[in-house]
């Protein structure tokens, strides 16, 4: 990692606990004004690779609710409403950080966890594999 | 929030600090085996709404490196390679959690922060506004 100069105003930490366990303030600073992904845009419906948003809930995780995109079609939607299988709808995935309660049910102790979520879908040209 | 039963094996927390400040174990548990998004798939190049990935680095943030997608075109790429401006390439955005060092430069004290990142692009039918 990058060496950070120690600031004398920092909370104290014993070497044995650092950097394995840190203090995190949960008063979230929101750098944007976005809302629920179902409301923030209608791209999921207007896309040539439209998707449905499924609610994934887990009380042992923060955030407890994550929206997962599932592509509606294997092909892509043309202007005439036909689904074109010469093109493929695929999920765009993003690795995100969440906090997992550890030990389970503990209100003030967490572990960082990386999970892969599908955020939306895009239309791609397929790679065609023919049989020799 | 959801009421979680207190587990007797939980680390202790004083009410005045809870739930504002919690302990977080930074030994990340990875629930997937994904790699750098530039390598994990070539969708960004094969999409009808292709995008470039830009590296956003901030040593005061964890993760310090985030990849931001920027759509290459305003329109969408057709099978013949031409860009169709009757359709629009738009970024798919995702709100993610990051840890921000607070106070600045402190190695073991963070604040949760929500930021909006563009993960990839999708091709949508534009909303046409006609002049009355």
């Amino acid at each position: 990692g990058i060496a950070i100069p120690r600031n004398s105003g920092c909370p104290n930490s014993e070497d044995k606990n650092f950097p394995r366990t840190v203090m995190v303030n949960l008063n979230i600073h929101n750098r944007n004004t976005s809302t629920n992904p179902k409301r923030s845009s209608d791209y999921y419906n207007r896309s040539t690779s439209p998707w449905n948003l499924h609610r994934n809930e887990d009380p042992e995780r923060y955030p407890s609710v994550i929206w997962e995109a599932k592509c509606r079609h294997l092909g892509c939607v043309k202007a005439d409403g036909n689904v074109d299988y010469h093109m493929n709808s695929v999920p765009i995935q993003q690795e995100i950080l969440v906090l997992r309660r550890e030990p389970r049910h503990c209100p003030n102790s967490f572990r960082l966890e990386k999970i892969l979520v599908s955020v939306g879908c895009t239309c791609v040209t397929p790679i065609v594999h023919h049989v020799a | 929030g959801i009421a979680i039963p207190r587990n007797s094996g939980c680390p202790n927390s004083e009410d005045k600090n809870f739930p504002r400040t919690v302990m977080v174990n930074l030994n990340i548990h990875n629930r997937n085996t994904s790699t750098n998004p530039k390598r994990s798939s070539d969708y960004y190049n094969r999409s009808t709404s292709p995008w470039n990935l830009h590296r956003n680095e901030d040593p005061e943030r964890y993760p310090s490196v985030i990849w931001e997608a920027k759509c290459r075109h305003l329109g969408c790429v057709k099978a013949d390679g031409n860009v169709d401006y009757h359709m629009n390439s738009v970024p798919i955005q995702q709100e993610i959690l990051v840890l921000r060092r607070e106070p600045r430069h402190c190695p073991n004290s963070f604040r949760l922060e929500k930021i909006l990142v563009s993960v990839g692009c999708t091709c949508v039918t534009p909303i046409v506004h006609h002049v009355a």
């Epitope: 439209p50 449905n52 599932k70 592509c71 509606r72 079609h73 294997l74 092909g75 939607v77 409403g81 036909n82 689904v83 299988y85 493929n88 709808s89 695929v90 999920p91 791609v124 397929p126 790679i127 065609v128 594999h129 023919h130 049989v131 | 094969r46």
Partner: antibody
Framework: EVQLVESGGGLVQPGGSLRLSCAAS????????VHWVRQATGKGLEWVSV???????TYNSALKSRFTISRENAKNSLYLQMNSLRAGDTAVYYC???????????????WGQGTTVTVSS | DIVMTQSPLSLPVTPGEPASISCRSS???????????FHWYLQKPGQSPQLLIY???NRFSGVPDRFSGSGSGTDFTLKISRVEAEDVGVYYC?????????FGQGTKLEIK
């Protein structure tokens, strides 16, 4: 209980038209795709068309110019309009539900009993 | 169009014995999303087809565990560990990765 009931089959002359219906119950057409699949006597299965939950469609390109799939959500019914019929279109026509949207398997999990179309002069 | 070729076309089996049907596609059935949309159906005499296996190896609800599916890419297999009298009929493989969706020509399983 999921049920699909086809109707509208019968004897028609070459060049004629026919409209098949499929009445669905136990599920909503705006939550599942529904296919038409046909089977000539003693032959295998041939896929005809599908209308997906969002109203988009996919056709067997060999038949697209003559066949049109549609649905009426209020009646929870699916239709197949067949024009310029030929002797080769003689078959049992099945409607079958797709697992699409809910489970994303893109397989046909429930089938109707079929309706027979005979094209002959 | 994707051609699905089944073998054998006829399969006489003694009850209690295993049975195996192969299906080969003319093109890979792996979608750009990484999944394979390959399925098996059974059409019993005088009945409509019924789904047995979806996405290569998943048994549809109510399908006995003596049925199993395997394979990848272009080569797939349906196995019945111990054939029962009620298993007679025509078995079809199918793909929905590419349009038009296609079926194999069918394998007729009969009891010896």
């Amino acid at each position: 209980e999921v049920q699909l009931v086809e109707s509208g089959g019968g004897l028609v002359q070459p060049g004629g038209s026919l409209r098949l219906s499929c009445a669905a119950s136990g599920f909503s057409l705006d939550s599942y795709g529904v296919h038409w699949v046909r089977q000539a006597t003693g032959k295998g299965l041939e896929w005809v068309s599908v209308i997906w939950s969002d109203g988009t469609t996919t056709y067997n390109s060999a038949l697209k110019s003559r066949f049109t799939i549609s649905r009426e959500n209020a009646k929870n019914s699916l239709y197949l309009q067949m024009n310029s019929l030929r002797a080769g279109d003689t078959a049992v026509y099945y409607c079958a539900r797709d697992t699409h949207y809910r489970l994303y398997y893109y397989a046909m999990d429930y089938w109707g009993q079929g309706t027979t179309v005979t094209v002959s002069s | 169009d994707i051609v699905m070729t089944q073998s054998p076309l006829s399969l006489p089996v003694t009850p209690g014995e295993p049975a195996s049907i192969s299906c080969r596609s003319s093109q890979s059935l792996v979608h750009s999303n990484g999944d394979t949309y390959f399925h098996w159906y059974l059409q019993k005499p005088g009945q409509s087809p019924q789904l047995l296996i979806y996405k290569v190896s998943n048994r549809f609800s109510g399908v006995p565990d003596r049925f199993s599916g395997s394979g990848s890419g272009t080569d797939f297999t349906l196995k019945i560990s111990r054939v029962e009298a009620e298993d007679v009929g025509v078995y079809y493989c199918s793909q929905t990765t590419h349009a038009p969706f296609t079926f194999g020509q069918g394998t007729k399983l009969e009891i010896k």
